[in-house]
């Protein structure tokens, strides 16, 4: 799988888009997980609504939201109030039974707010020495939680 890099600004929202074949993944729920090391397991962060027909409703886990355009074939993840510790490798997944297919690997890059002049020297970044291959950069601002969208409480 190729990896796509999305760049966002610390303190702002980052919107990640994972396109997929809507027919091939018809009826499947989706998930967003964080890769623990380059070859480690992928830890689930948030998944789409339990009812596939309601996948368009935004679900939250903490500051991360997910919504799925099942007709257009685009999974969208929003990382709100992006922080340095959010940087790293993630996956967009398609779920079937207990299995998960990788739709796309995503590398999130966090950059300084150009209007914030505080020294970032003491901030902690995971895996500073690591580098990941296959990248694409995108930056966008997400919309806020709309009426009727379902917040997803943090999991323990």
């Amino acid at each position: 799988h190729n990896t796509t890099v999305f760049q966002g600004v610390a303190g702002q929202s980052l919107q990640v888009s994972c396109p997929y074949d809507s027919m091939k993944h018809w009826g499947r729920r989706k998930a967003w997980c964080r890769q623990l090391g380059e070859k480690g397991p992928c830890q689930r962060v948030v998944s789409t609504h339990n009812l596939w027909l309601l996948s368009f409703l935004r679900r939250w886990n903490g500051s991360t939201a997910i919504t799925d355009d099942t007709l257009g074939g685009t999974l969208t993840i929003t990382l709100r109030n992006l922080q340095p510790h959010d940087a790293g490798l993630y996956q967009c997944q398609s779920l079937h039974g207990s299995e998960a297919d990788t739709l796309r690997k995503v590398l999130v890059e966090v950059l300084a707010d150009p209007l914030d002049h505080r020294d970032a020297g003491d901030l902690w970044f995971p895996g500073e020495s690591e580098s990941f291959e296959d990248a694409h950069v995108e930056h966008s601002i997400s919309r806020s939680l709309l009426e009727g969208e379902i917040p997803f409480p943090p999991t323990s």
Epitope: N2, T3, V5, Q7, P84, E109, L111, F125
Partner: antibody, heavy 118, light 107 residues
């Protein structure tokens, strides 16, 4: 005004290493990825990789992973690229270029010419 | 790696001509495409990003179009200062790759 100022031309012997710099005044250095691009005489452009000056993380084209090391110094707003085990194939112009948020390398350095010759 | 193919490496044009340069990706790049202009001895200059967005300061005679795998750079009325090499670049997957370039020459 954004200006990327690259170090001067280099003439080095095969097998040696070289470290070139790209000074980036005029903007918030840690708010943009800094890329490096290779161009051999009369040929096209080749992406080497980028450095994130905020996190010090880097992302390399697999082809250059054993050839190039990208670093940066926030205090001087300078990005560096070290090339090792040089051969005549490494003779080229090397550009640094800033990634804009709208995709695309919006500001480029003037290029550093590297000549590898015995 | 995604291959970016510019079908013509060079072609002869006349001043005032409408010029169309094409770029084809080996897979869908979801409009993550930039166009650059480069003159001999100079660094490339970004003209268009996101396949269609004209950069600040770029003359309006330049435009970009396309989607999926196929993209086009158009110059409506070629001026002397437009004689250069034009390259496309994709951003969808790294290694970010460039087309081989298309050199415009005056007839």
């Amino acid at each position: 005004e954004v200006q990327l100022q690259q170090s001067g031309p280099e003439l080095v012997k095969p097998g040696a290493s070289v470290k070139m710099s790209c000074k980036a005044p005029g903007y918030s250095f840690t708010s943009y990825l800094m890329n490096w691009v290779k161009q051999k005489p009369g040929q096209g452009l080749e992406w080497i990789g980028y450095i994130n000056p905020y996190s010090a993380g880097s992302n390399y084209n697999e082809k250059f992973k054993d050839k190039a090391t990208l670093t940066s110094d926030k205090s001087s707003s300078t990005a560096y690229m070290e090339l090792r085990s040089l051969t005549s194939e490494d003779s080229a112009v090397y550009f640094c270029a800033r990634s804009s948020y709208r995709y695309g390398f919006d500001y480029w350095g003037q290029g550093t010419t590297l000549t590898v010759s015995s | 790696d995604i291959q970016m193919t510019q079908s013509s490496s060079s072609f002869s044009v006349s001043l005032g001509d409408r010029v169309t340069i094409t770029c084809k990706a080996s897979e869908d790049i979801y409009n993550r495409l930039a166009w650059y202009q480069q003159k001999p001895g100079n660094a490339p200059r970004l003209l268009i990003s996101g396949a269609t967005s004209l950069e600040t300061g770029v003359p309006s005679r330049f435009s970009g179009s396309g989607s999926g795998k196929d993209y086009t750079l158009s110059i409506t009325s070629l001026q002397t200062e437009d004689v250069a090499t034009y390259s496309c670049q994709q951003y969808w997957s790294t290694p970010w790759t460039f087309g081989g370039g298309t050199k415009l020459e005056i007839k």
